[in-house]
Interface confidence: low
């Protein structure tokens, strides 16, 4: 990759090793200013693989609230509005970064954590295993 | 909410204000050990709203590589394998947290940033506006 010269105005760090402890400003910068927050708000209901959203709360995590998608059906909704079990509703999962308080209950010390969340559901053709 | 007593072993913090700077250990803890690695590997191809994945790289961000989904079609794939334009393929988007180097090019100083990524696509019934 490209080697970028270190900024001389960087804060000092005593620990030069990786894994390392870094300083993080929790004043979140939001790059999503041009997005319409309503745009995908009803996909969960209009999808052929609809899903429900469940609240997952953990005060020791930042962000403390994460919404998890759970597919409503094993099959997908067909043109008649019925569930077609020849197709499968499956969760689309994504790994996300969260901050975990470490040591526990500390307001100013965190560890980076990777968790798997279900973001929504999609309709897929099932894999059929043919027995010889 | 429940007030959790502060752990007496917490690191000291000089800045008690919010927005605040915190210490974060970048040694990522992975909570996803029980996931089946095959489970979602080919949904992008098998979905009725298939998508391609594009690499988004930014050395000033952590993680530096994020993969973005882009729906292949405006419509959805029907049972005959053709694109049905009476339905719409739409991206499922999620806001995720990343770390942005701040000041730029600093190895040990970051700011939390929220970005919107497309994780995959789902097939939805279109909203039809009838003109009076």
């Amino acid at each position: 990759g490209i080697t970028i010269p270190r900024n001389p105005g960087c804060p000092n760090s005593e620990d030069k090793n990786f894994p390392r402890t870094v300083m993080v400003n929790l004043n979140i910068h939001n790059r999503n200013t041009n997005t319409n927050p309503k745009r995908s708000s009803d996909y969960y209901n209009r999808s052929t693989s609809p899903w429900n959203l469940h609240r997952n709360e953990d005060p020791e995590r930042y962000p403390s609230v994460i919404w998890e998608a759970k597919c409503r059906h094993l099959g997908c909704i067909n043109a008649d509005g019925n569930v077609d079990y020849h197709m499968n509703s499956v969760p689309i999962q994504q790994e996300i970064l969260v901050l975990r308080r470490e040591p526990p209950h500390c307001p100013n010390s965190f560890r980076l954590e990777k968790i798997l969340v279900s973001v929504g559901c999609t309709c897929v053709t099932p894999i059929v295993h043919h027995v010889a | 909410g429940i007030t959790i007593p502060r752990n007496p072993g917490c690191p000291n913090s000089e800045d008690k204000n919010f927005p605040r700077t915190v210490m974060v250990n970048l040694n990522i803890h992975n909570r996803n050990t029980n996931t089946n690695p095959k489970r979602s590997s080919d949904y992008y191809n098998r979905s009725t709203s298939p998508w391609n994945l594009h690499r988004n790289e930014d050395p000033e961000r952590y993680p530096s590589v994020i993969w973005e989904a882009k729906c292949r079609h405006l419509g959805c794939i029907n049972a005959d394998g053709n694109v049905d334009y009476h339905m719409n393929s739409v991206p499922i988007q999620q806001e995720i947290l990343v770390l942005r180097r701040e000041p730029p090019h600093c190895p040990n100083s970051f700011r939390l940033e929220k970005i919107l990524v497309s994780v995959g696509c789902t097939c939805v019934t279109p909203i039809v506006h009838h003109v009076a």
Epitope: I92, Q93, Q94, E95, I96, L97, K114, L116 | T35, P37, K38, R39, S40, S41, Y43, Y44, L53, P63, S64, V65, I66, W67, I96, V117, V119, G120
Partner: nanobody, 119 residues
Framework: EVQLVESGGGLVQPGGSLRLSCAAS????????MYWVRQAPGKGLEWVAS????????YYVDSVKGRFTISRDNAKNSLYLQMNSLRAEDTAVYYC????????????WGQGTLVTVSS
């Protein structure tokens, strides 16, 4: 720190062969399914092949079946892709990836190795 380093790419004529290697470190290699994926110029990512932890199960995208063979050596923390009967449409940057290829959030990918098939 997870590291994946691919090698073995290069320029080859149609019908030729190449063997790609991926050296893994920073995680328990034998505990993860591994993947080869590729990205042709200006195109989206395409999954090519995957192999289970113990090498017992292998999967291939239809376009490479019978031509490509994925293998692994857990003792050496290495993943391989033997590519035979190469075609122009196999031209791409090839990446090895750890675990599932979705979601694609973490940079558990190498920088890739370029394979160019041209006469």
């Amino acid at each position: 720190e997870v590291q994946l380093v691919e090698s073995g790419g290069g320029l080859v004529q149609p019908g030729g062969s190449l063997r790609l290697s991926c050296a893994a470190s920073g995680f328990t290699f034998s505990s993860y399914g591994m993947y080869w994926v590729r990205q042709a110029p200006g195109k989206g990512l395409e999954w090519v092949a995957s192999i289970e932890q113990d090498g017992s199960e292998k999967y291939y995208v239809d376009s490479v079946k019978g031509r490509f063979t994925i293998s692994r050596d857990n003792a050496k923390n290495s993943l391989y892709l033997q590519m035979n009967s190469l075609r122009a449409e196999d031209t791409a940057v090839y990446y090895c990836a750890k675990g599932e290829i979705l979601p694609l959030y973490f940079d558990y990918w190498g920088q890739g190795t370029l394979v160019t098939v041209s006469s």
